[in-house]
């Protein structure tokens, strides 16, 4: 093989990739916020709701400083995969009850999938550990009632909002280290 002719820049630099990942995360955070408002408006919640199958919040904003790029991206990917699974479950299980939120829930699922793909690409470009996702969890049981499903929707959107808020802060901080 002879000397290289060189090649044009094929795709975004990882730092530019991180910028667009932050933008996409912010956009998804806003989508989630708006959807949460809609849900509360149509189905008022009585206090906070939890769902045992949801991931626990990765990190408090104050502890972000100590985090490393690999751990943030790996944890974020795992948590978002779980939320994607929960949104898919919610749409399947509550199709008729949440019909009024359906276009927005569908958009949320599509954007969540896109963000996961973006994170995956960023990890590949940086050659960070591609840890396998957690072993497949048992299928989520259908909600026991319509109200049970609505409580689950509150829990899913609330948890996703907190996770995305943490993600934006974490990614912005990591940008300074790349």
């Amino acid at each position: 093989p002879g000397p290289p002719p060189g090649s044009p820049r094929a795709s975004p630099d990882p730092r530019a990739e991180l910028d667009s990942t932050v933008l996409l995360t912010r956009s998804l955070l806003e989508d989630t916020r708006q959807l949460t408002i809609q849900l509360k408006d149509k189905f008022p919640a009585d206090g906070d709701h939890n769902l045992d199958s949801l991931p626990t919040l990765a990190m408090s904003a104050g502890a972000l400083g100590a985090l490393q790029l690999p751990s943030v991206l790996t944890r974020l990917r795992a948590d978002l995969l779980s939320y994607l699974r929960h949104v898919q479950w919610l749409r399947r299980a509550m199709g008729s009850s949440l019909k009024t939120l359906e276009p927005e829930l569908g958009t949320l699922q599509t954007r969540l999938d896109r963000l996961l793909r973006r994170l995956q690409l960023l990890m590949s470009r940086l050659a960070l550990p591609q840890l396998p996702p957690d072993p497949p969890a048992p299928p989520l049981a259908p909600p026991s009632s319509t109200w049970g499903g609505i409580r689950a929707a509150h829990a899913i959107l609330g948890g996703l909002h907190l996770t995305l808020d943490w993600a934006v802060r974490g990614l912005l901080l990591l940008k300074t280290r790349l």
């Epitope: 060189g6 090649s7 820049r9 094929a10 795709s11 630099d13 990882p14 730092r15 690999p70 995969l81 996961l116 793909r117 995956q120 690409l121 590949s124 470009r125 940086l126 050659a127 960070l128 550990p129 591609q130 396998p132 996702p133 790349l178």
Partner: antibody, heavy 114, light 111 residues
Framework: EVQLLESGGGLVQPGGSLRLSCAAS????????GHWVRQAPGKGLEWVAV????????YYADSVKGRFTISRDNSKNTLYLQMNSLRAEDTAVYYC???????WGQGTLVTVSS | QSVLTQPPSASGTPGQRVTISCSGS?????????VHWYQQLPGTAPKLLIY???ERPSGVPDRFSGSKSGTSASLAISGLRSEDEADYYC???????????FGGGTKLTVL
């Protein structure tokens, strides 16, 4: 323009050692993972080793584990592959690559023969 | 034997559409990992053709497209041209090997 230029290939006897280098230019090398991929004559691509953007993570194909070492010097924009205990089956064109890999060098030929 | 399985050869006439498949497993393509495609023209280094299943790097014609479903992926080339004659490789990360893996490659002949 992005360039990756490999050097250090050549003829070596079985059991011998070689060190390949790859000089990167035209992009922010320190923001990309670095790979070595090889291609035996008339065969397909085989991934050899990868190192993370900052050098903290390294992975190797089973066929080279314990014999090859990947490293990088971001201050010199250079990727390295130290190859020890070389075998005839290591004969191949060795490509240096960066990112997904997004960018590839033109390759350097390593021949292991007595 | 490659971890990702591709047909060894494919062919088509100029203007035709050809598809090259890449079959994996739950530890690579099926594990939410992206598939990338490379083109290797005779006597040259591989070049990134498709990344993240379906994204085209700048400079790659839109005749080339990629898709992924389950544990398989495919590369489609429409409006086949003589200069497309090359070897095509798919690649993905593999959990069980803790590293990227390539398909065995598909030699595309333009008749």
């Amino acid at each position: 323009e992005v360039q990756l230029l490999e050097s250090g290939g050549g003829l070596v006897q079985p059991g011998g050692s070689l060190r390949l280098s790859c000089a990167a230019s035209g992009f922010t090398f320190s923001s990309y993972g670095g790979h070595w991929v090889r291609q035996a004559p008339g065969k397909g691509l085989e991934w050899v080793a990868v190192i993370s953007y900052d050098g903290s993570y390294k992975y190797y194909a089973d066929s080279v584990k314990g014999r090859f070492t990947i490293s990088r010097d971001n201050s010199k924009n250079t990727l390295y592959l130290q190859m020890n205990s070389l075998r005839a089956e290591d004969t191949a064109v060795y490509y240096c690559a960066a990112g997904v890999p997004d960018y590839w060098g033109q390759g350097t030929l390593v021949t292991v023969s007595s | 034997q490659s971890v990702l399985t591709q047909p060894p050869s494919a062919s088509g006439t100029p203007g035709q559409r050809v598809t090259i498949s890449c079959s994996g497993s739950s530890s690579n393509i099926g594990s939410y990992y992206d598939v990338h495609w490379y083109q290797q023209l005779p006597g040259t280094a591989p070049k990134l053709l498709i990344y993240s299943n379906e994204e085209r790097p700048s400079g790659v014609p839109d005749r080339f497209s990629g898709s992924k479903s389950g544990t398989s992926a495919s590369l489609a080339i429409s409006g086949l041209r003589s200069e497309d004659e090359a070897d095509y490789y798919c690649a993905a990360w593999d959990d069980s090997l803790s590293g990227p893996v390539f398909g065995g490659g598909t030699k595309l002949t333009v008749l």
